[in-house]
């Protein structure tokens, strides 16, 4: 049985203190520039080396930021969200959603040396080949009618 990639979503409150160069990360998203399809949320796109966020270590690229100092980031233009961060105080409280990729395999014990799942291309290539063969056979059959 093949492994299946799922996501474990967890939330965390991260309190950051502005360093000499600020909070030290970039964001994407907003109602005017959706980063994720059908989601106007705000996501971390880059964490700057040696910035406050990098030194704290909890905020990760790809994390979704739900609120800043208790203020919801839903339905904000990108620039309004940026403003909210820039004009926040010295101590900034972030409510963050992490998406952890987890491998869901068959029920039962998986040995330490076992692979954690089959790469997707190893499944797709045979499926694609079979589809092509079936299509070819169907076309030949139609020609004979």
């Amino acid at each position: 049985m093949n492994g299946r990639v799922d996501y474990l979503v967890t939330e965390e409150e991260i309190n950051l203190t502005r360093g000499p160069s600020g909070l030290g990360f970039n964001i994407v998203g907003g109602t005017d520039q959706q980063y994720v399809s059908n989601d106007s949320g705000i996501y971390v796109s880059r964490i700057k080396e040696n910035g406050a966020a990098a030194l704290d270590g909890r905020l990760q690229e790809g994390d979704k930021i739900l609120s800043v100092n208790g203020q919801d980031l839903k339905n904000l233009l990108h620039q309004d969200a940026v403003d909210l961060f820039r004009n926040a105080g010295y101590a900034v409280s972030l409510r963050v959603q992490h998406r952890l990729q987890v491998q869901n395999g068959p029920i039962g014990h998986r040995g330490e040396g076992d692979p954690s799942g089959i790469p997707i291309f190893m499944v797709l290539v045979p499926v694609f080949a079979l589809t092509m063969v079936a299509a070819w056979a169907f076309m030949r059959y139609r020609q004979q009618l």
Epitope: Q79, D80, V82, D83, R86
Partner: nanobody, 120 residues
Framework: QVQLVESGGGLVQAGGSLRLSCQAS????????MAWFRQAPGKEREFVAA????????YYADSVKGRFTISRDNAKNTVYLQMNNLKPEDTAVYYC??????????????WGQGTQVTVS
């Protein structure tokens, strides 16, 4: 590189007024958001006011609402902070900050050296 130069600070009596100016120079500056922050002795730097265009937005800290007014002259790349009804607790070094208009950083990109405001 962008340089920010503040001016207009000084000593003023409580209830008085001051007008701070901050001029941005440097070929890379593109009329992005600009702001004023302040830092009182022994305290952390705090946000005072910010202004941006496209779309136009103006923000104030609760402690200065109704007393301070931020404005800008895009042709001169200058932002102003008109401070009225000053109080002793407004005493601080006032810093100007600016960001490039397309920056996605959650921090201001440039900072001035600061100008001292003392309210007696």
């Amino acid at each position: 590189q962008v340089q920010l130069v503040e001016s207009g600070g000084g000593l003023v009596q409580a209830g008085g007024s001051l007008r701070l100016s901050c001029q941005a120079s440097g070929r890379t500056f593109d009329s992005g958001p600009m702001a004023w922050f302040r830092q009182a002795p022994g305290k952390e730097r705090e946000f005072v006011a910010a202004i941006r265009r496209s779309p136009e937005r103006i923000y104030y800290a609760d402690s200065v609402k109704g007393r301070f007014t931020i404005s800008r002259d895009n042709a001169k790349n200058t932002v102003y902070l008109q401070m009225n009804n000053l109080k002793p607790e407004d005493t601080a070094v006032y810093y100007c900050a600016a960001a490039l208009s397309r920056s996605t950083s959650v921090d201001y990109d440039y900072w001035g050296q600061g100008t001292q405001v003392t309210v007696s």
